[in-house]
Each structure stands twice: as structure tokens, then as C-alpha cells.
Interface confidence: low
């Protein structure tokens, strides 16, 4: 089976992880999407999901996680605000499409949160000021209870697109794989 790769992000407590999952509009715009954590030897656990059907640009907040699905751009934005050391772990974005198994991304996110503040370029010193800029009209969505056993034992089939070049070889209507665009501050 193809081995899933990981991208490691090291952030400080109080900062915000900001991930954008780039998906095929034609196929997945209204599909329910979710943010999952993967613990060693366990099934992926869904931490937050969009509504079903997913609503355009409508923030869904579950605790410190905010999901926003931008249908026009084929982007699911996932934010984990006010990061804590205990948030460290392995995460992934998935698209639900019952009764089929969820579609998963090829690069999982290995998040490492440490104490203290960083002033390095690419991290935002003022990120804690953004933590509370959450729209008041957020909703909580019920997530499907099932998770796919495949995520523990084998990787999904290899995408036809290069992970670092979203859509570079993607047909508008015939694609079943999704590609993640990682961003964080």
C-alpha cells in the first residue's frame, strides 16, 4: 500500500493552525467535510464537520475548531485557534460521501505545539489577537459516527495530481481525490 506522508508544523501555544483543503468543486462542493485526529493504533476520530449538505462560507465552530467551506474556490478552511500543547498530534481533512468511505488526503498534518512564542517569519506574532475574531453566527453540525477502517490499515489510492501542484492535472468532472493546501500562522 502507498504510505501516507506527513507534513510537520511546529507552532507555539496561543497561535492558530490554518489549513486549507483544496477539493474538486464539481464533485465535492456540497459534500460534508470533516477534520479528524489520528491517534496511534486507533481509528481516526472526527473532531468537527460541516453541515450536510455543506453550506457555502458558513462557519461551523466546535470548541476551538472552526470550519468554513468556500464552494466558489473549492476550499475547506480549518482553523484551530488558541493552540495548546495537548493539541499536538496527527490530523487529516476528509470528505464524507456515504455510503462510500470518506475521501482522505495524502499528506497528514503532524502538529507539534510547544510553549512560548515564536517571532520567525511565517508565524504571526499577533495570531492570538485573531483567536476571538470568530463570526457570532457559527453553528455546530452533527458528524457521522462511522470512521473508515482503511485509514488505519492502508492508504487511499495514489492521486493523479501532484500534491504540491493542486489541480495541475485534474479534470473538472472526473476526479475523486483531493489535495491539501497547508497554511498556518
Amino acid at each position: 500500500a502507498t504510505k501516507l506522508t506527513e507534513e510537520k508544523y511546529e507552532l507555539k501555544e496561543g497561535q492558530t493552525l490554518d489549513v486549507k483543503c483544496d477539493y474538486t468543486l464539481e464533485k465535492f462542493a456540497s459534500s460534508q467535510k470533516a477534520w479528524q485526529i489520528i491517534r496511534d493504533g486507533e481509528m481516526p476520530k472526527t473532531l468537527a464537520c460541516t453541515e450536510r449538505p455543506s453550506k457555502n462560507s458558513h462557519p461551523v465552530q466546535v470548541g476551538r475548531i472552526i470550519l468554513e467551506d468556500y464552494h466558489d474556490h473549492g476550499l475547506l478552511r480549518v482553523r484551530m485557534v488558541n493552540l495548546q500543547v495537548e493539541d499536538s498530534g496527527l490530523y487529516q481533512c476528509v470528505i464524507y460521501q456515504p455510503p462510500k468511505e470518506p475521501h482522505m488526503l495524502f499528506d497528514r498534518i503532524r502538529l507539534v505545539v510547544t510553549k512560548g512564542f515564536s517571532g520567525t517569519p511565517g508565524s504571526n506574532e499577533n495570531s492570538t489577537q485573531n483567536v476571538y475574531k470568530i463570526p457570532p453566527t457559527t453553528t455546530k453540525a452533527l458528524c457521522p459516527l462511522y470512521t473508515s477502517p482503511r485509514t488505519v490499515t492502508q492508504a487511499p489510492p495514489k492521486s493523479t495530481a501532484d500534491v504540491s501542484t493542486p489541480d495541475s492535472e485534474i479534470n473538472l468532472t472526473n476526479v475523486t481525490d483531493i489535495i491539501r493546501v497547508p497554511v498556518f500562522n
Epitope: 468556500y70 473538472l172 497554511v183 498556518f184 500562522n185
Partner: antibody, heavy 121, light 113 residues
Framework: QLQLQESGPGLVKPSETLSLTCTVS??????????WGWIRQPPGKGLEWIGS???????YYNPSLKSRVTISVDTSKNQFSLKLSSVTAADTAVYYC?????????????WGQGTLVTVSS | DIVMTQSPDSLAVSLGERATINCKSS????????????LAWYQQKPGQPPKLLIY???TRESGVPDRFSGSGSGTDFTLTISSLQAEDVAVYYC?????????FGGGTKVEIK
């Protein structure tokens, strides 16, 4: 008013690396709403997309140039940069930096004035 | 890559007359899920960078005169200048942003007859 300004050498020798910097003023490059891109235009010809970057450093490169291109960002200076290695005369062009919207599938709404880079020995 | 083909290459129109530029994409840039065409139009005057005129195929950018309009869907698009003014002399480019890499048309040069 947002302004973008390209800077860098106007003459580069073949096989060397072209390096350009785009300085953004009138707005923060760290805004979570925008991507930033490089586009080039050979003299008398059309426009070609080179690549784009998010303030965090997440990049997209045109596959036709991917093996030679590096785009980076320096949020502390409100700048992003382009490096194009192993240049040839075919890389002679006006290089523009531009602001994009929130997502890869978006137009360029603010452009720098452009800088002409000539590849010649 | 999606190939964008513009026609004509150049166009000479009398002041006050209508100018029409065509752009054809090698595959559809319309997504049925949101019924949006991922196409933009730019104007480039000599010695200047391109200026955004139209996005989503027909939405005018803020500050663009209403004599500029965009139309079309799927693979065939048109930029129309309803009443050509002297300041409209420029090269016009279409660009698709449905699939990366973004690609531009070859440009149409608009001159005064």
C-alpha cells in the same frame, strides 16, 4: 492604497539564478485573505503564470517551471521573492508580482509595475 | 493545461463604436455546482501592468466603466466595449482560473480606426 513593487537585477547571465523581490505596501502580506503571485511576460508576448504563495509559505508552482522555481515569503519585511534557476534567453521577460484572492482559483486584482529581466552574457 | 484562444489578434474600431473580443477555452471553465465561469478579463496599456476588468466572466471590477461587459459560458466568452473611447486602446487578455496552472489568452490588440 495597496502597492506592489518589484526589485532585483535587470541583467542575469545564462545558467545563473534570477532573483526578484516584491515589496508590499499599504497592506499586510500576512492577511489570511490573500495569496501572492508572480507572472511574467516576454517582450511583445503574452502572460505566463509562474506561481503563488500564502503568507505561511505554502506555495504553488506552474508545472512547466516547477523544477527551477522557488517562491518564498518574509512577513517581517512584508515581501515575497522569486528565484528562477538555470536561466536562458527564453526567460527574458517583464516579471510582475500580483495579489491574488483567497484560493488558487482566483484572479489578480493588484499588480506591480513590473521589472524587465534580460538574460544575456 | 487549459488553452485559451483569443480572436481576433487585433481589432480597429472607430471611436464610439462597439468592439467585441472573443475568448475560447479548450475545456469548460463552468462549474455546475455553483454555476460560475472561472474566467477573467484584463486590460494592458503600453508600458503598464495588466488591469483587472472582469471576473466570474461577467462581474465588473470596482471602478471599471460600464461600457465594458463580459458574457459567455462554458468554453466561449466575449468582452464587449460598447462605445470605444481613446483611452481604451490597449491589449486585452482573458484568463481562466478553473484549473491550475492559470492560463491566459494570447491577447487582442484594440486600436482606433
Amino acid at each position: 492604497q495597496l502597492q506592489l513593487q518589484e526589485s532585483g537585477p535587470g541583467l542575469v547571465k545564462p545558467s545563473e539564478t534570477l532573483s526578484l523581490t516584491c515589496t508590499v505596501s499599504g497592506g499586510s502580506i500576512s492577511s489570511s485573505s490573500y495569496y501572492w503571485g508572480w507572472i511574467r511576460q516576454p517582450p511583445g508576448k503574452g502572460l505566463e503564470w509562474i506561481g503563488s504563495i500564502y503568507y505561511s509559505g505554502s506555495t504553488y508552482y506552474n508545472p512547466s517551471l516547477k523544477s527551477r522555481v522557488t517562491i518564498s515569503v518574509d512577513t517581517s519585511k512584508n515581501q515575497f521573492s522569486l528565484k528562477l534557476s538555470s536561466v536562458t534567453a527564453a526567460d527574458t521577460a517583464v516579471y510582475y508580482c500580483a495579489r491574488l484572492g483567497d484560493g488558487y482559483r482566483i484572479w489578480a486584482d493588484y499588480w506591480g509595475q513590473g521589472t524587465l529581466v534580460t538574460v544575456s552574457s | 493545461d487549459i488553452v485559451m484562444t483569443q480572436s481576433p489578434d487585433s481589432l480597429a474600431v472607430s471611436l464610439g463604436e462597439r468592439a467585441t473580443i472573443n475568448c475560447k477555452s479548450s475545456q469548460s471553465v463552468l462549474y455546475s455546482s455553483n454555476n460560475k465561469n472561472y474566467l477573467a478579463w484584463y486590460q494592458q496599456k503600453p508600458g503598464q501592468p495588466p488591469k483587472l476588468l472582469i471576473y466570474w466572466a461577467s462581474t465588473r471590477e470596482s471602478g471599471v466603466p460600464d461600457r465594458f461587459s463580459g458574457s459567455g459560458s462554458g468554453t466561449d466568452f466575449t468582452l464587449t466595449i460598447s462605445s470605444l473611447q481613446a483611452e481604451d486602446v490597449a491589449v486585452y487578455y482573458c484568463q481562466q482560473y478553473a484549473l491550475t496552472p492559470y492560463t491566459f489568452g494570447g491577447g487582442t490588440k484594440v486600436e482606433i480606426k
